[in-house]
Interface confidence: low
């Protein structure tokens, strides 16, 4: 339904509070370096304009598109060229090219200072002094650091953030109440950001069809009692929501997400028996709850898949008549029967089925050709099962830190050209799969592990895309979305890599390491480990373990010494010499 004024339509649908919050998120995700005060000024100007349009939809400029209105507003920023360089050239373009240009300049790794958490009393005072500014600042700081964060979900995080301060700032022990809540929000926020980044990469790099296939598989696992037509409708609506959010259309995205939650709750009887609690919650909580809802029970009487997809004489006829619908039905039927498979595995099976039909439906005897197609699935299923089994055993044997180190070595040998900070960050996150998924029973391990690994490897892909240094990473990231993990798993040591020259400075440590937190100290040691492997890619596990054990002992010894700096200088030289000897550097 067409509206005379799009901005008035969204303002009325969302309400002033959500409108302002979403415009702030949108602006902060586009202009990530702009000061908070500048963004607030822009948002207030847009909001005042929107109110004039609500009062009179025929008023001047009210008929303009949101991209035009927002883009014009962003292009008024005086320091655009000084702060953003060539991004300023976007302002010379017309819509829709201007918005595409802004999107292309979003930075997944902006050069922003690490957020230091203020003291609890300081935060509570700031919260009480000006609650609105305090919460806006939270939205701004998260949005500029995570330019693809799912905007309606960020509103939900902000609501929880506000609730935490409201409760804890009047508690007897403010810190004991608040800090665990903030830690939880931080960790959940990072995970939410990474999951959404994969959705946007899927849409932007592999297209709508790839995203829809992912959504069919996931929703069919979650709602196995729903009819195919119902799942298809949900997939279409969900694709629209995420396309809008990934495209910077945050007002439309939030509005459509609310409509989708309303539809799901009105039709829960034909979707899932698990939605009742979610649907009793307020809007933001409801949408979040639906997105995280557990899988419904599988219908008891599901027939064998083979009848419709292998044994039927009409397989090629049905495929030829509507390829994507038939493949969608295959994916739906397979996924609803297999909550124990990862979504990416289900997509690999569907791709294998599609390739087989493409080949066989053109053969002399199609049925004979595709009769054994399900046999081709066996190795595809066993590969992630075996990999998860092996890695969970290794995790249980080593614990998280040493498991991360094993992955650091593995991935540095595979792609040594990648920057050390990226290798450390990605390998640490890959290593978290152990504590996240290995505790689950067999039936839940694969969907937990492989779909989580897809999210983490996407982080590697988007960071690498900014500064490409490895053809192997580019190849694994771009060839197939669903085969990224198997592609990285299959990489062996890069024999073409010329080892980094040894630089003693890289392995020179100072007494400041003693004042770091345990996590930061681990990162320092893991950084050194990556550098060691880059110097000596052929070093054995045993050699590296010996050097790392010596290193840990060296840090412990010098941190206990009276004259720490001297200890680090003198013992450090000995350690470097011993390491060079041990590794043959």
């Amino acid at each position: 339904d067409a509206h005379k004024s799009e901005v008035a339509h969204r303002f009325k649908d969302l309400g002033e509070e959500n409108f302002k919050a979403l415009v702030l998120i949108a602006f902060a995700q586009y202009l990530q370096q702009c000061p908070f005060e500048d963004h607030v000024k822009l948002v207030n100007e847009v909001t005042e304009f929107a109110k004039t349009c609500v009062a009179d939809e025929s008023a001047e400029n009210c008929d303009k598109s949101l991209h035009t209105l927002f883009g014009d507003k962003l292009c008024t920023v005086a320091t655009l060229r000084e702060t953003y360089g060539e991004m300023a050239d976007c302002c010379a373009k017309q819509e829709p090219e201007r918005n595409e240009c802004f999107l292309q300049h979003k930075d997944d790794n902006p050069n922003l200072p690490r957020l230091v958490r203020p003291e609890v009393d300081v935060m509570c005072t700031a919260f009480h002094d000006n609650e609105e500014t305090f919460l806006k600042k939270y939205l701004y700081e998260i949005a500029r650091r995570h330019p693809y964060f799912y905007a309606p979900e960020l509103l939900f995080f902000a609501k929880r953030y506000k609730a935490a301060f409201t409760e804890c700032c009047q508690a007897a022990d403010k810190a004991a109440c608040l800090l665990p809540k903030l830690d939880e929000l931080r960790d959940e926020g990072k995970a939410s950001s990474a999951k959404q980044r994969l959705k946007c990469a899927s849409l932007q790099k592999f297209g709508e069809r790839a995203f829809k296939a992912w959504a069919v598989a996931r929703l069919s696992q979650r709602f196995p009692k729903a009819e195919f037509a119902e799942v298809s409708k949900l997939v279409t609506d969900l694709t629209k929501v995420h396309t809008e959010c990934c495209h910077g259309d945050l007002l439309e995205c939030a509005d459509d997400r609310a409509d989708l939650a309303k539809y799901i709750c009105e039709n829960q009887d034909s979707i899932s028996s698990k939605l009742k609690e979610c649907c009793e919650k307020p809007l933001l909580e409801k949408s979040h709850c639906i997105a995280e809802v557990e899988n419904d029970e599988m219908p008891a009487d599901l027939p064998s898949l083979a009848a419709d997809f292998v044994e039927s004489k009409d397989v090629c006829k049905n495929y030829a008549e509507a390829k994507d619908v038939f493949l969608g039905m295959f994916l739906y039927e397979y996924a609803r029967r297999h909550p124990d498979y990862s979504v990416v595995l289900l997509l690999r099976l569907a791709k294998t089925y599609e390739t087989t039909l493409e080949k066989c439906c053109a053969a002399a005897d199609p049925h004979e050709c595709y009769a054994k197609v399900f046999d081709e699935f066996k190795p595809l299923v066993e590969e992630p099962q075996n990999l998860i089994k092996q890695n969970c055993e290794l995790f249980e044997q080593l614990g998280e830190y040493k498991f991360q180190n094993a992955l650091l070595v593995r991935y540095t040998k595979k792609v040594p050209q990648v920057s050390t900070p990226t290798l450390v960050e990605v390998s640490r996150n890959l290593g978290k799969v152990g504590s996240k998924c290995c505790k689950h029973p067999e039936a839940k391990r694969m969907p937990c592990a492989e779909d989580y690994l897809s999210v983490v490897l996407n982080q590697l892909c988007v960071l690498h895309e900014k500064t490409p240094v490895s053809d192997r990473v580019t190849k694994c990231c771009t060839e197939s979305l669903v085969n990224r993990r198997p592609c990285f798993s299959a990489l062996e040591v890069d024999e073409t890599y010329v080892p980094k020259e040894f630089n003693a400075e890289t392995f020179t440590f100072h007494a400041d390491i003693c004042t770091l937190s345990e996590k930061e100290r681990q990162i320092k040691k893991q950084t050194a480990l990556v550098e060691l492997v880059k110097h000596k890619p052929k070093a054995t596990k045993e050699q590296l373990k010996a050097v790392m054990d010596d290193f840990a002992a060296f840090v412990e010894k010098c941190c206990k010494a009276d004259d720490k700096e001297t200890c680090f200088a003198e013992e450090g030289k000995k350690l470097v010499a011993a390491s060079q000897a041990a590794l043959g550097l």
């Epitope: 203020p118 003291e119 004042t515 770091l516």
Partner: nanobody, 117 residues
Amino acid sequence: EVQLLESGGGLVQPGGSLRLSCAASGFTFSQFGMSWVRQAPGKGPERVSAISSDGSGTIYADSVKGRFTISRDNSKNTLYLQMNSLRPEDTAVYYCTIGSSTTPSGPGQGTLVTVSS
């Protein structure tokens, strides 16, 4: 917002003493290691001393060892630097920083220490 306000500097004769203070706010002071850094005119910043979050670990540059003492009072969110046996070469702007950074962590201007007869 992080605030670090240094005080206690001034003009002192060689061999004299001064005690610098750094009042911290806007972050959980007790969870961070802290440093004193100085910058002499025309020179780069030099870390003078650092202290762990609980005060148990300390570090000193060779040039100040035995003369300067770093300490902290987490209940007051304050970092201290006791400077004895001052020398002309200790003349510099002194500022405190979070962690082991040698760049200012907050808007504080530092405090000027001048050692001259």
